[in-house]
């Protein structure tokens, strides 16, 4: 029968001679050279050669366990004289013995990961994994230990699992957003002489709402003409928020001030500005200055950061109303006057009054629109608005006179107003009857 143990061969042999594997031997071998040993199978005749007389096997090349850990060969012992096998053909194994010739290799050259800013210490970030091609079943050649080469004191790595965690409290994205962490994986359980590999982990802190909006100035002033219709934008204010995305969204509101019902603030979603608009008609003559308190607040607040203070800020907005010169206003929309048809020239019929509505109360002068009184039957006192006749009247010619009176500001002739006057001529019995027959 065959006599051998399992053959073991150290990988990566660096000697100058062929590497001795072992000896095939049959108990039929009397040592007289009558037996011939033949090798077949994995690498026979190429990687492995056999001394056909002695049965000694040698390896002709450096072997790499990580390429092929086991070689299966077959052995034959033949009687040289008869050419017949003296043993049944038998399979045997050459097992390649591991040495620590492979460093750990990470599954990725570069990892990217994110973790929320302000996370608690020990918050999971990412897990890195390195594999070692050496034999995990023998020695520590494939026993990998992780350590952090760069990235302290911000991050730590669990030595056995490769799990990266936050290691520092209150890491603030607004202060620093990007971190580059270098992780080492070392075999031999991390002991001296172990082989190592490294990977880079790019960690980005993601935003949380830990910053309130802040107005860059405490006071704003805008001016607007009193003629601005409701909806008119009169100014923009902008609070800044160091956060990003929805955490930086701002809503504006008017919280206090005399202009609470006179103005609105709307949020421009594009620019995150507050637009102050006119809500009700303004009147310089009633109020010239409004002071508002405008608040900027985050609509999305994280309760755990409320201890940092209120997530809002306020500013004072002073709105100054500009005077717009307005034309005089008559005391009535129309005047109806009466006069007897027998009235003498210069008879006063009545009067009109108009007043400058502006605070300055500019004096007003009156005149008759001559297009409406071509015959110049009526006149007006330019100072007090008294209407009087300048010609004799005849009811039988015209029963009603419709004229227009103009009021003009003396200091500003561009500002004028018009009002209709309806003058009724009253009948006086001044005509004898005509066309009547008198019967006897």
């Amino acid at each position: 029968s065959w006599m051998w143990n399992q053959f073991f061969l150290l990988e990566e042999y660096t000697g100058s001679d062929y590497q001795y594997v072992g000896k095939l031997h049959s108990d039929q071998d009397r040592g007289d050279g009558s037996l011939k040993y033949i090798l077949s199978g994995d690498g026979a005749g190429d990687l492995f050669i056999i001394n056909e007389n002695t049965g000694d096997i040698q390896a002709t090349k450096r072997l790499d366990r990580e390429e092929k850990p086991v070689y299966i060969l077959r052995a034959q012992a033949i009687n040289r004289r008869t050419g017949r096998p003296v043993e049944p053909e038998s399979e045997f194994i050459i097992k390649i013995h591991d040495i620590n010739d492979n460093e750990p290799i990470f599954t990725k050259e570069v990892y990217t990961a994110t973790v929320p800013e302000m996370s608690d210490v020990g918050t999971f970030v990412v897990q890195v994994t390195a594999t070692d091609a050496d034999d995990p079943t023998y020695g520590n050649s494939a026993k990998v230990v992780y350590s952090i080469l760069q990235g302290q004191p911000y991050f730590s790595v669990e030595s056995e699992t490769g799990i990266i965690k936050t290691a520092l409290l209150n890491m603030d994205r607004e202060n620093r957003e990007q971190y580059q962490v270098v992780i080492q994986a070392k075999d031999m359980g991390g002991q001296m002489g172990g082989l190592s590999g490294t990977t880079t982990v790019n960690i980005t802190l993601t935003d949380v709402n830990d910053n309130p909006p802040r107005f860059p100035q405490s006071t704003y002033q805008f001016k607007t003409p009193e003629s601005s219709p409701p909806g008119t934008p009169i100014g923009r204010i902008k609070a800044s928020d160091a956060d990003v995305g929805e955490n930086a969204e701002i809503e504006y509101s008017i919280t206090d001030g005399e202009g609470l019902d006179m103005f609105d603030v709307i949020t421009d979603q594009e620019t995150q500005e507050g637009i102050i608009t006119v809500k009700k008609l303004l009147d310089f003559e009633k109020k010239k200055v409004y002071t508002l308190k405008v608040e900027a607040s985050n609509p999305y607040v994280e309760p755990r950061f409320l201890y940092l203070g209120p997530f809002k800020d306020s500013a004072t907005v002073r709105i100054v109303v500009e005077d717009v010169d307005e034309p005089p206003v008559f005391s009535k929309l129309a005047y109806i006057l009466q006069i007897r048809e027998d009235a003498q020239i210069n008879t006063t019929i009545g009067s009109v009054t108009a007043q400058d509505p502006d605070a300055a109360r500019n004096p007003v002068k009156y005149s008759v629109d001559r297009h409406t009184d071509m015959d110049r039957i009526f006149n007006i006192d330019s100072g007090n608005g008294s209407i009087f006749t300048s010609k004799l009247l005849d009811r039988e010619t015209l029963l009603w006179h419709n004229i227009t009176v103009i009021a003009t500001e003396i200091n500003n002739p561009k500002q004028s107003s018009r009002v209709p006057l309806y003058i009724k001529v009253l009948d006086v019995n001044d005509n004898a009857p005509t066309g009547l027959s008198t019967g006897a």
Partner: antibody
Framework: EVQLVQSGAEVKKPGASVKVSCKAS????????MHWVRQAPGQGLEWMGW????????EYNQKFQGRVTITADRSTSTAYMELSSLRSEDTAVYFC???????????????WGQGTLVTVSS | DIQMTQSPSSLSASVGDRVTITCKAS??????LAWYQQKLGEGPKLLIY???TLQTGVPSRFSGSGSGTDFTLTISSLQPEDFATYYC????????FGQGTKVEIK
């Protein structure tokens, strides 16, 4: 030309009131804001309030709210500033100053009165 | 409220000197700034408005510059009648004055 002429110096006891006048000429009195500014001895200038003589509307510095009253008499083109509950720290020169704009309550002061010294002393 | 800080508080100079006075606002006031000159026993006199516009009748040796929060008044060649106290004033929102700069004869 525009002129603002103020009333003469006053000496008052603590707790009393003082009324300083400012007569305007050379422009339409009702069309410009009239401001009052004070200056304590060796100190800077401090804005107190304004009046729009056209309709009598006023605005006061919060610091003086409740103690200061500014009025105007359109018939004589005169503005008045009355300060009540006087204390020693109210000792100052009080100036009237014309606001540059007629149409809105803003802007700088283009003409000033000569000032009225008010001394508060017991 | 907006605060105005003027510097220096006083300076000594000779006739013909170039003098620069600065004024700093506690927040952006754009160009809403005026400079006044005040002589002893008189009311202030407007020199410059809107930060850099010379008031009518004021000599051209006076000039103003700046916007936002930092402003300067420059007297290019000091004259005997220029020895006085100078004030800056913001009128962006309400009214506030600097504490003044006294220009004295060296």
């Amino acid at each position: 030309e525009v002129q603002l002429v103020q009333s003469g110096a006053e000496v008052k006891k603590p707790g009393a009131s003082v009324k300083v006048s400012c007569k305007a000429s050379g422009y339409t009195f009702t069309r410009n804001f009239m401001h009052w500014v004070r200056q304590a001895p060796g100190q800077g200038l401090e804005w107190m309030g304004w009046i729009y003589p056209g309709d009598g509307e006023t605005e006061y510095n919060q610091k003086f709210q409740g103690r200061v009253t500014i009025t105007a008499d359109r018939s004589t083109s005169t503005a008045y500033m009355e300060l009540s509950s006087l204390r020693s720290e109210d000792t100052a020169v009080y100036f009237c100053a014309r606001g540059v704009y007629g149409g809105f309550a803003g802007g700088y002061f283009d003409f000033w009165g000569q000032g009225t010294l008010v001394t508060v002393s017991s | 409220d907006i605060q105005m800080t003027q510097s220096p508080s006083s300076l000594s100079a000779s006739v013909g000197d170039r003098v620069t006075i600065t004024c700093k606002a506690s927040q952006n006031i754009y160009k809403n700034l005026a400079w006044y000159q005040q002589k002893l026993g008189e009311g202030p006199k407007l020199l410059i408005y809107d930060a850099n516009t010379l008031q009518t009748g004021v000599p051209s040796r006076f000039s103003g510059s700046g916007s936002g929060t930092d402003f300067t008044l420059t007297i290019s060649s000091l004259q005997p009648e220029d020895f006085a106290t100078y004030y800056c004033q913001q009128y962006y929102s309400g009214w506030a004055f600097g504490q003044g700069t006294k220009v004295e004869i060296k």
